[in-house]
């Protein structure tokens, strides 16, 4: 399986909220011996490997933000801890998972990574990740709502 990032760049005004999204693609085994571990973290575009370094998002580590479930189930992270930091990560039945960040500040700008690990009974784990950039802007040049740029081309979309 692979991870797709529908949007590679999110440009948002300060104070707005944004939902960063990743989607599982390809043959996803939904057998009973398969579990998916999904999480989010900040990173940097490293020389060796983008998304290798795992930095916290608003002081929450990738362990704090992880989702764990079998192929059939939807899941949410522990709400209390995340929501206290204005965060919520979630996953649906269709392979899409996301992190929502409320009340954006300039400090939220940076590279964000989603990570999916497929855990199989008696097998090695299989990991894939996706990366996207968040730019939080302030002042007269800031958009009124978040503008997202699809990964495949640079056509932008407004999201409210």
């Amino acid at each position: 399986f692979k991870v797709a990032t529908p949007y590679s760049l999110y440009v948002c005004p300060e104070g707005q909220q944004v939902t960063l999204t990743c989607r599982l693609l390809g043959p996803v085994d939904k057998g009973h011996d398969v579990t998916f571990y999904k999480t989010w973290y900040r990173s940097s575009r490293g020389e060796v490997q983008t998304c290798s370094e795992r930095r916290p998002i608003r002081n929450l580590t990738f362990q704090d933000l992880h989702l764990h479930h079998g192929g059939h189930q939807a899941a949410n992270t522990s709400h209390d801890l995340a929501q206290r930091h204005g965060l919520e990560s979630a996953s649906d039945h269709h392979g899409q998972f996301s992190i929502t960040m409320r009340n954006l500040t300039l400090l939220d700008s940076g590279l964000y990574c989603c990570l999916v690990v497929e855990i199989r009974h008696h097998h090695s784990e299989h990991r894939v990740h996706g990366a996207m950039e968040l730019q939080v802007q302030t002042g007269k040049d800031a958009p009124s709502n978040c503008v997202v740029y699809p990964s495949s081309s640079q056509d932008s979309e407004n999201i409210t």
Partner: antibody, heavy 117, light 107 residues
Framework: QVQLQESGPGLVKPSETLSLTCTVS????????WSWIRQPPGKGLEWIGY???????NYNPSLKSRVTISVDTSKSQFSLKLSSVTAADTAVYYC???????????WGQGTMVIVSS | EIVLTQSPATLSLSPGERATLSCRAS??????LAWYQQKPGQAPRLLIY???NRATGIPARFSGSGSGTDFTLTISSLEPEDFAVYYC?????????FGGGTKVEIK
């Protein structure tokens, strides 16, 4: 912060079964692989195997026929059973939390198990 | 099974000196390699994950490099508390395996 504590007998007779338990405190047992690693006196580290909260297991082939790892989520414990032990199984046994696609980030303090008659 | 070979087995250095530890894999492990420090009577402690990223709370004097089959752990200037045994560990394939260790001792 997750903490781990191993418990079990420090002396086991040859041909018997070694049984150890690791108690997890300060965190959810649903967040990690739960692994056992051992270290014979003066030697290096050997991964025995893990269990994920979902029940998925993975064992070192060198020990697979003798190893069972189980989890009791209600007690926040996971256990190791190693059958038909010999003197070569004498080691410090560590339990550790192993985050998927990451590393062994938290370890118990280790418990010495001697196999001797 | 992937075999990790660490060299040298023992490294004798003085505080303040630079330590360079090597770990070589029998086949490529990409960058899925961790380093641990173990002091006598203690459990190992995670230093580096994914070849070159410092774990939380690890001082900047520790750095990792490499990918594929050849990896290096460097301690830029040895502090007295750094004298210990260091292990590398791969996680690209099961079983998970560790190197035999490098002991960094006081000269």
């Amino acid at each position: 912060q997750v903490q781990l504590q191993e418990s079990g007998p420090g002396l086991v007779k040859p041909s018997e079964t070694l049984s150890l338990t690791c108690t997890v405190s300060g965190g959810s047992i649903s967040s990690y692989y739960w692994s056992w690693i051992r270290q014979p006196p003066g030697k290096g580290l050997e991964w025995i195997g893990y269990i994920y909260y979902s029940g998925s297991t993975n064992y070192n082939p060198s020990l697979k026929s003798r190893v069972t790892i189980s989890v009791d989520t209600s007690k926040s414990q996971f256990s190791l059973k190693l059958s038909s032990v010999t003197a070569a199984d004498t080691a410090v046994y560590y339990c550790a939390s192993d985050i998927p696609a990451f590393a062994f980030d938290i370890w118990g303090q280790g418990t010495m198990v001697i196999v001797s008659s | 099974e992937i075999v990790l070979t660490q060299s040298p087995a023992t490294l004798s250095l003085s505080p303040g000196e630079r330590a360079t530890l090597s770990c070589r894999a029998s086949q490529s492990v990409s960058y899925y390699l961790a380093w641990y420090q173990q002091k006598p009577g203690q459990a190992p402690r995670l230093l580096i994950y994914d070849a070159f990223n410092r774990a939380t709370g690890i001082p900047a004097r520790f750095s990792g490099s490499g990918s594929g089959t050849d990896f290096t752990l460097t301690i830029s200037s040895l502090e007295p508390e750094d004298f210990a045994v260091y292990y590398c560990q791969q996680r690209i394939n099961w079983p998970l395996t560790f190197g035999g260790g490098t002991k960094v001792e006081i000269k």
